[in-house]
């Protein structure tokens, strides 16, 4: 039985340079308890894009659009996109602990950047 699903509905998103990119993610349960974080790339060299609890992410805002009972919205918007922002973005659920441990990742959304 699946305990929880992390759903990134968009396999890819294309955004013009200078515009904002919305990266969608919904999660089907708060259990196991623990935070949601966004990363660009996978593996040990991945880059933290957003963590609500700590850090400063001036280009990122949260975008909660879903009012459905069956899931919760953990989508983000990244402003002023540049070609350097291209890559695959992952919405990742962690299980609370010391330290928190990765529990489940979404399938990823590939962001491509078009010229203005």
């Amino acid at each position: 039985e699946e305990e929880l699903q992390v759903i990134q509905p968009d396999k890819s998103v294309s955004v013009a340079a200078g515009e904002s990119a919305i990266l969608h993610c919904t999660v089907t349960s708060l259990i196991p308890v623990g935070p949601i974080q966004w990363f660009r790339g996978a593996g040990p060299a991945r880059e933290l894009i957003y963590n609500q609890k700590e850090g400063h992410f001036p280009r990122v805002t949260t975008v909660s659009e879903s009012t459905k009972r069956e899931n919760m919205d953990f989508s983000i918007s990244i402003s002023n996109i540049t070609p350097a922002d291209a890559g695959t973005y992952y919405c990742v659920k962690f299980r609370k602990g010391s330290p928190d441990t990765e529990f489940k990742s979404g399938a990823g959304t590939e962001l491509s950047v078009r010229a203005k």
């Epitope: 708060l30 196991p32 919205d73």
Partner: antibody, heavy 118, light 112 residues
Amino acid sequence: EVQLVESGGGLVKPGGSLRLSCAASGFTFSSYVMSWVRQTPGKGLEWVATISSGGTYTYYPDSVKGRFTLSRDNAKNSLYLQMNSLRAEDTAVYYCASQLTGSEFDYWGQGTTVTVSS
Amino acid sequence: DIVLTQSPASLAVSLGERATISCRASESVDLYGTSFMHWYQQKPGQPPKLLIYRASNLESGVPDRFSGSGSRTDFTLTINPLQAEDVATYYCHQSSDELPWTFGGGTKVEIK
């Protein structure tokens, strides 16, 4: 129609044990996070325990941690709360409640009364 | 622990008028722009019943005279217009990712 039916409440002496059960019907039990919430006239509503849909993860407030154990049997659509080392302050109406997303409590049973007294 | 303070503890409102209940959290219950604050109605001898989930979403089957609003630490449940069957005690509840989950102390709504 969703139904949650609690049983197992009663009078027990301090230090004693009780096992509460909750029989679920009318929904896909194995997809739901399940919890117990208790209510006393003095303290109001208090969250007591939560278990993940597959039964892997359990959570308790400090007030019951180490004394209460929550489990489930998805094949039987049943939830169980084993309560040990009971104290007078555990006296309450205990409600079984479902949480589709592990967030709000969607459905509640009618409750079962636990009285801890010598 | 996140403490939820409801006010007033009791409220008497005339039929057809507006009833407003406040719930203040000791710290934010918002995650990614969603407020994990919920409202329940409890009538004597009955279990609580979900009215509003995640601050402002009306649970299926609940009359639209009930509404919820607020974010971060300040939340409101409004009943407008109040009807006789709304006499009950109302509770707020937070389910942020910081355990333990907690409830407000309740607000008893009566008819003036």
